[in-house]
Amino acid sequence: IWELKKDVYVVELDWYPDAPGEMVVLTCDTPEEDGITWTLDQSSEVLGSGKTLTIQVKEFGDAGQYTCHKGGEVLSHSLLLLHKKEDGIWSTDILKDQKEPKNKTFLRCEAKNYSGRFTCWWLTTISTDLTFSVKSSRGSSDPQGVTCGAATLSAERVRGDNKEYEYSVECQEDSACPAAEESLPIEVMVDAVHKLKYENYTSSFFIRDIIKPDPPKNLQLKPLKNSRQVEVSWEYPDTWSTPHSYFSLTFCVQVQGKSKREKKDRVFTDKTSATVICRKNASISVRAQDRYYSSSWSEWASVPCS
Amino acid sequence: RAVPGGSSPAWTQCQQLSQKLCTLAWSAHPLVGHMDLREEGDEETTNDVPHIQCGDGCDPQGLRDNSQFCLQRIHQGLIFYEKLLGSDIFTGEPSLLPDSPVGQLHASLLGLSQLLQPEGHHWETQQIPSLSPSQPWQRLLLRFKILRSLQAFVAVAARVFAHGAATLSP
């Protein structure tokens, strides 16, 4: 058993039929010694008396809010949550496996630049009695500070018969060094509590590996005289790190016909313009990637050819 | 050229070669996303590699103030990785494919280090750790880790030279 936060405790249980469970001793937080009784949740049934209460925790029916009283007055509370371990593996019932970029990916994170700011998100089908707490650090043995905000519900989607909820959190490395080569990964830890079930999820990454620039901005076409060719121009996204002579991007320009089956013409360039042939009913799209490190491409910015 | 006395390197040449190094490092080990190397333990094997750290002056302002600190750090790293790529980690079993970019990568590391430090000048270089994995699978894992680490190193070096070529060239 360990303390998650003040008056909230997590009991770690091996979860299998007829498991013996864990013996837990609760202590009433009071100077009083006599006349103390214990109850669980809303029940008025007295579970025991005295300053301490010993219980055998085997299942969710044994978890909940234990309260010690004296003469009708509440003295203190202890909330017990369960963390299940099945076949040596901690349960992951609360969050959905996003399966990208690999199986058992529960947390996904992205950064728009090298400033030390990143966003992580996760999915669940649970809609109520759900809380998340996020902690992060750079490295684990001698951790350096990363500040995370509150996790917020960022999207709701219908998936078949189920509703899916996306939560996200923003974090910022306290003393980020955008130009340095990272040697210690960022660690992100999410505590998830659904009713009386506790689970924790972790992710470890370098900012450089989760970089995904915003799409190029101000995408424009300039027809060239007496030609089917056009000059496409664009700018670096506002949110990309500066100066651009140091934090450079490379770009992919694509000409795509109306039909998905039509051949796509692609040009790669380090410049912020390119000359391409604009076909009727086609569109021109541009996306960006770090020039020197192959992290994710941005989403496409597009304009119609006409 | 960046000599210990403090004259300027051939920024544009260094920029071109460092960008080529980035391309080679990724073509030598493209499938990085499919293997989370941090989960493979064995941290001590790559802990000793030289990293370009916050105080090394490789940020835009540090380069403007005095690029020598940064260039010396990059030079140390290039020599270190050049030695690693020439060691039995890469020359031993399992053999690299004949058209593997590792050979080109090795030569380009040497080329860039020589651009930074011509014959007759000596910056102190970092000792290469004695890594001699006994099993072929250990060697393979170590190659992945070294190449992964090299990708991050040459990305920073390429940014430095690109910025230098754009803002510090005479």
């Epitope: 728009k112 630049n113 090298y114 400033s115 030390g116 700011r117 966003t119 500040t147 995370c148 905000g149 509150a150 996790a151 917020t152 960022s154 996200s168 959190v169 923003e170 910022q172 306290d174 003393s175 955008p178 915003d214 506002d238 949110t239 990309w240 790190s241 500066t242 934090f247 | 940020d59 302002q61 403007r64």
Partner: antibody, heavy 120, light 107 residues
Framework: EVQLLESGGGLVQPGGSLRLSCAAS????????MSWVRQAPGKGLEWVSS????????KYADSVKGRFTISRDNSKNTLYLQMNSLRAEDTAVYYC?????????????WGQGTLVTVSS | DIQMTQSPSSLSASVGDRVTITCRSS??????LGWYQQKPGKAPKLLIY???NLQGGVPSRFSGSGSGTDFTLTISGLQPEDFATYYC?????????FGPGTKVDVK
């Protein structure tokens, strides 16, 4: 073109409340941290509060902590400052500002400001 | 909290002069410092961010330098439109703090 337009200022008695709004246009509002800065008549600039792009993290100057609340509605491209328990020393022009390049804290773009006067 | 000091608090100069304003922080803020210009009745305007980066559209006669605790704003040839109050701001950590300002007026 980036535009920030503050509103909601005015005369209020000590102990009263006001809610300032800042309507943003010309950029993707949900992608940027935002701040409020104030300037008392004839005095220098004082940072008041900041909010991250998602709204999930907020920070306040000690002088307003517990009395002011910063919030944002990304669907309406609007930043808010709820000011309670106002004091005479809160009298100032309040500016909203968009934070800057590559996630930096630089206050890159500013509105023209709205005047809050706390007086009986 | 990080305290910011600026010197001088005011200065008189003529068009064409080279003007230097310094800003000092009570603890290191790396390069996380900006310089702002404010004219009476107007909102402040960012001139320099990240200690030395010139904000787009700002004339090149403005330049910034320094790191850690000591920073400088230089106006290489003062123009009539440059008479204003200048503030530095550290955005290294919350709470962000401004310097008290330097008023540049006509000699």
């Amino acid at each position: 073109e980036v535009q920030l337009l503050e509103s909601g200022g005015g005369l209020v008695q000590p102990g009263g409340s006001l809610r300032l709004s800042c309507a943003a246009s010309g950029f993707t509002f949900s992608g940027y941290d935002m701040s409020w800065v104030r300037q008392a008549p004839g005095k220098g600039l004082e940072w008041v509060s900041s909010i991250w792009s998602s709204g999930g993290y907020t920070k306040y100057a000690d002088s307003v902590k517990g009395r002011f609340t910063i919030s944002r509605d990304n669907s309406k491209n609007t930043l808010y400052l709820q000011m309670n328990s106002l004091r005479a020393e809160d009298t100032a022009v309040y500016y909203c500002a968009r934070q800057g390049v590559g996630g930096s804290g630089s206050l890159l773009y500013w509105g023209q400001g709205t005047l809050v006067t706390v007086s009986s | 909290d990080i305290q910011m000091t600026q010197s001088p608090s005011s200065l008189s100069a003529s068009v064409g002069d080279r003007v230097t304003i310094t800003c000092r922080s009570s603890q290191g803020v790396r390069y996380d410092l900006g310089w702002y210009q404010q004219k009476p009745g107007k909102a402040p305007k960012l001139l320099i961010y990240g200690a030395f980066n010139l904000q787009g559209g700002v004339p090149s006669r403005f330049s910034g330098s320094g790191s850690g605790t000591d920073f400088t704003l230089t106006i290489s040839g003062l123009q009539p439109e440059d008479f204003a109050t200048y503030y530095c701001l550290q955005d290294f950590q919350y709470p962000f703090t401004f310097g008290p300002g330097t008023k540049v007026d006509v000699k």
